[in-house]
């Protein structure tokens, strides 16, 4: 899908807009809010009833090169006694983010935007019961 | 920036790091993944730490619509459907990259922006405060 025009109307293109070749767009990868910090509750991945681990994926041809993925530790959820309760399910919560992919074609380099699905953490859910006819 | 492996046959002038500004194809790879979390799963209703999804829309951003989760309760829902306050519902937050139109309103000029979104909620045991 192409990036949509601003809103749903055709805005007047401001005079200050840079010239861009057809079929492409200019992207500044100096990140706005680069230094903001996540203020998530302390070590929730361990305190959760659906705990998870983190793994870092690394790809030098991707920007950002490092993407952190969560994996649920259990199929069930952890009960008050610290035991796994398989009557409940730990499930992944996912979120899309954008990355820039660098592609080499011979000696020329091109850049492509890519949507990546990141598993952020896990939550404990009641299972769906399928009734057999 | 980040270093990339260099093709030995290419001229040496190539920068090892990502340049500050790049020209990218207007088509986005993997664009068909579902962006509406309400349609992709009903975890937000079935979770012991259920959440509501709030639509955040900004035409100067791509994607223009982002769904923000807000935990419905401070406690967690137990097997009887009651709220347990000896457990807490907390948001799971994630930094994501989006495109911000720069300069504003320009159709094909963007800058990457990092934003913090609450994706869902999880049920946690409360923090133990040790009194000195």
């Amino acid at each position: 899908r192409k990036i949509p025009k601003v809103g749903h109307t055709f805005f007047q293109k401001p005079e200050s807009c840079p010239p861009v070749p057809g079929g492409s767009m200019k992207l500044d990868i100096g990140i706005i809010n680069e230094n903001q910090r996540v203020s998530m509750s302390r070590n929730i991945e361990s305190r959760s009833t659906s705990p998870w681990n983190y793994t870092v994926t690394w790809d030098p041809n991707r920007y950002p090169s490092e993407v952190v993925q969560a994996q649920c530790r259990n199929l069930g959820c952890i009960n008050a006694q610290g035991k796994e309760d398989i009557s409940m399910n730990s499930v992944p919560i996912q979120q899309e983010t954008l990355v820039v992919r660098r592609k080499h074609q011979g000696c020329s380099v091109s850049f492509q935007l890519e949507k990546v699905l990141v598993t952020v953490g896990c939550t404990c859910v009641t299972p769906v019961i399928h009734h057999v006819q | 920036g980040i270093t990339i492996p260099r093709n030995p046959g290419c001229p040496n002038s190539e920068d090892k790091n990502f340049p500050r500004t790049v020209m990218v194809n207007l088509n986005i790879h993997n664009r068909n993944t579902n962006t509406n979390p309400k349609r992709s799963s009903d975890y937000y209703n079935r979770s012991t730490s259920p959440w509501n999804l709030h639509r955040n829309e900004d035409p100067e951003r791509y994607p223009s619509v982002i769904w923000e989760a807000k935990c419905r309760h401070l406690g967690c829902i137990n097997a009887d459907g009651n709220v347990d306050y000896h457990m807490n519902s907390v948001p799971i937050q994630q930094e994501i990259l989006v495109l911000r139109r720069e300069p504003p309103h320009c159709p094909n000029s963007f800058r990457l922006e990092k934003i913090l979104v609450s994706v869902g909620c999880t049920c946690v045991t409360p923090i133990v405060h040790h009194v000195a």
């Epitope: - | 959440w51 509501n52 401070l74 709220v83 306050y85 000896h86 409360p126 133990v128």
Partner: antibody, heavy 118, light 113 residues
Amino acid sequence: EVQLVQSGAEVKKPGATVKISCKASGYTFTDYEMHWVQQAPGHGLEWMGVIHPGGGGTAYNQKFKGRVTITADTSTDTAYMELSSLRSEDTAVYYCTRGDHDGRTDYWGQGTLVTVSS
Amino acid sequence: DIVMTQSPDSLAVSLGERATINCKSSQSLLNRSNQKNYLAWYQQKPGQPPKLLVDFASTRESGVPDRFSGSGSGTDFTLTISSLQAEDVAVYFCQQHYTTPFTFGPGTKVDIK
């Protein structure tokens, strides 16, 4: 200073509906929950239900059998409790009280007396 | 629902003497993960809303005189007024906030002998 100010006393006929407001100030309304408690003469304190204005979740006491509805307006930092199908035994003082993530209810409104009489 | 019981229903104590109120819950209010008991004690005077005195069984709220103390764990709890003052005449309630529906004890009326 945290304050919860409730609407004034009401006199209602059996079968009617009453809606009481509770205006919060002195704290971030969406960071806490609002609980409602009934105190009927000779019946002690009865928890009715709770709302989390920041997340929209509600929970109710089944003893009120679907007659109670709790809402919140985050634009005015006000919580509401509506009790329908009123009967004489609903004559009571109704309190709103702020709850935290541990369920601690530390600040209470001044109470609203509802009298149900034909 | 968790049932809360209190004893005695009422008691009369001389000024400066000790008053002890007991509260029992039908199930444990102890959260093993943080070792907290989700039990609160309230004081209510005529025409006023309840006032939180003690929470988590033994944590006194700020501004509450130190003659008030709470103790107990699991299902058995006690509120003690070490030296009764005239302004302590009131009804005292215990309440569990472990799970909904929150439930209160029937109250204990404290008077001066």
